[in-house]
C-alpha cells in the first residue's frame, strides 16, 4: 500500500474474477475511484468502479470475460492499482503486484440437494461454479448443518479433504428440519482462503415409523 | 469482444431531445466503461460523455453539460445518451465505444466502436 492507513486485498476465482477490497481511513466516500489491472503477459487491461461497502472501505469486481473463460495462469502477474480521482487529476492511492493462484477464492458452491432422505441420515450433493479445470481433484470441502436451537457458528465442522461433491449425514433426529451449508477451498495458493459458504439447503428427516423404538 | 450497436439518431429543431442507444453483444457487458463520441462533417471525432462500468460515475465534455446524460442498464446490455434543448452544433453522426480500461476510453485508436448514428438539429 502507499500509505500505513491503507489495505487493499484481492482474490481471484480461478477463472475470470478478482475481487477487491480496498479501506483507507478518512478516505471520501463521494470519490471516484477504480481498481486497474495491468497483467505482465496479456493484452487486456481492465478496470472497475469501487463502490463503497462501510464508512471506509471499498469493494468492486474485475470481471476479465465469460463466467467459465480461464483469463489467467499461474505464471501470470496483475498488477492491481488503486487510483482515486483529485481534482482533475487521478492519485495512485495503493498497488500490488498480484499473482492470481497464490490468492484463490472459489465461488460458493451451488445446486445443493438433497440425494436422498431417511430418518437418521441424509446424502447431498453440489456442485463447484466456475472453478480451474488446472485443479484437476486437489480441492477440500467443509461442511456444516444447522440443528434445532442452535446456530451456524455453533456446528462442528466436518472436513473432506478431497474432491467429493456429495456427504451422507448421519446420526440425525427423525421428523427433523436442518439446515446445510458447504465451502469449498483449492490446495493451491499461499494466501489462499476458503470461499464464501453455499446459500443454506433446508430438508427434513423422515418421521420414525410407528411402533419402532 | 464486444459489438456495439447504435439507434435512436434523427432530425429535431433545436431545443427538441433525442434519446440514443447503443446495444451492447458478445461479451460481458459490464466489463466495458462505455463512452459517446461524435464528428461532425469535417471535424475530427470527439468526446462527448462515458459512464463507469457500475454507472456510478459519468464525464461530460463541457459544451453538453446539463443538457446531456449519460446512463446504462447493465441488465439490458445498453447504454444511453439523453440529448436534451439540443441546439444546431449538436449535428454530428453519433458513436458508442466500449473499453474495459476506463483510462483508456478517449483513446480513439483503443476503443471498440459502433457504427454511429446520425443526430441533425435543425433552426
Known amino acids: 500500500a502507499v500509505n500505513g492507513t491503507s489495505r487493499f486485498t484481492c482474490f481471484y476465482n480461478s477463472r475470470a474474477n478478482i475481487s477487491c477490497v480496498w479501506s483507507q481511513d478518512g478516505a471520501l466516500q463521494d470519490t471516484s475511484c477504480q481498481v486497474h489491472a495491468w497483467p505482465d503477459r496479456r493484452r487486456w487491461n481492465q478496470t472497475c468502479e469501487l463502490l463503497p461497502v462501510s464508512q471506509a472501505s471499498w469493494a468492486c469486481n474485475l470481471i476479465l470475460g465469460t463466467p467459465d473463460s480461464q483469463k489467467l495462469t499461474a505464471v501470470d502477474i496483475v498488477t492491481l492499482r488503486v487510483m482515486c480521482r483529485e481534482g482533475v487529476r487521478w492519485r495512485m492511492m495503493a498497488i500490488q503486484d498480484f499473482k492470481p493462484f497464490e490468492n484463490l477464492r472459489l465461488m460458493a458452491p451451488i445446486s445443493l440437494q438433497v440425494v436422498h432422505v431417511e430418518t437418521h441420515r441424509c446424502n447431498i450433493s453440489w456442485k463447484i461454479s466456475q472453478a480451474s479445470h488446472y485443479f484437476e481433484r486437489h480441492l477440500e470441502f467443509e461442511a456444516r448443518t444447522l440443528s434445532p436451537g442452535h446456530t451456524w457458528e455453533e456446528a462442528p465442522l466436518m472436513t473432506l479433504k478431497q474432491k467429493q461433491e456429495w456427504i451422507c449425514l448421519e446420526t440425525l433426529t427423525p421428523d427433523t428440519q436442518y439446515e446445510f451449508q458447504v465451502r469449498v477451498k483449492p490446495l493451491q495458493g499461499e494466501f489462499t482462503t476458503w470461499s464464501p459458504w453455499s446459500q443454506p439447503l433446508a430438508f427434513r428427516t423422515k418421521p420414525a415409523a410407528l411402533g419402532k423404538d | 469482444q464486444v459489438q456495439l450497436q447504435e439507434s435512436g439518431g434523427g432530425l429535431v429543431q433545436a431545443g427538441g431531445s433525442l434519446r440514443l442507444s447503443c446495444a451492447a453483444s458478445g461479451d460481458v457487458f459490464v466489463r466495458y466503461t462505455m463512452a459517446w463520441f461524435r464528428q461532425a462533417p469535417g471535424k475530427e471525432r470527439e468526446f462527448v460523455a462515458s459512464v463507469t462500468d457500475s454507472g456510478r460515475t459519468t464525464e461530460y465534455v463541457d459544451s453538453v453539460k446539463g443538457r446531456f446524460t449519460v446512463s446504462r442498464d447493465n441488465a439490458k446490455n445498453t447504454a444511453y445518451l439523453q440529448m436534451n434543448n439540443l441546439k444546431p452544433e449538436d449535428t454530428a453522426i453519433y458513436y458508442c465505444?466500449?473499453?474495459?480500461?476506463?483510462?483508456?476510453?478517449?483513446?480513439?485508436?483503443?476503443?471498440?466502436w459502433g457504427q454511429g448514428t446520425q443526430v441533425t438539429v435543425s433552426s
Open positions: 465505444a466500449a473499453n474495459t480500461d476506463y483510462f483508456q476510453i478517449r483513446s480513439l485508436d483503443l476503443n471498440t
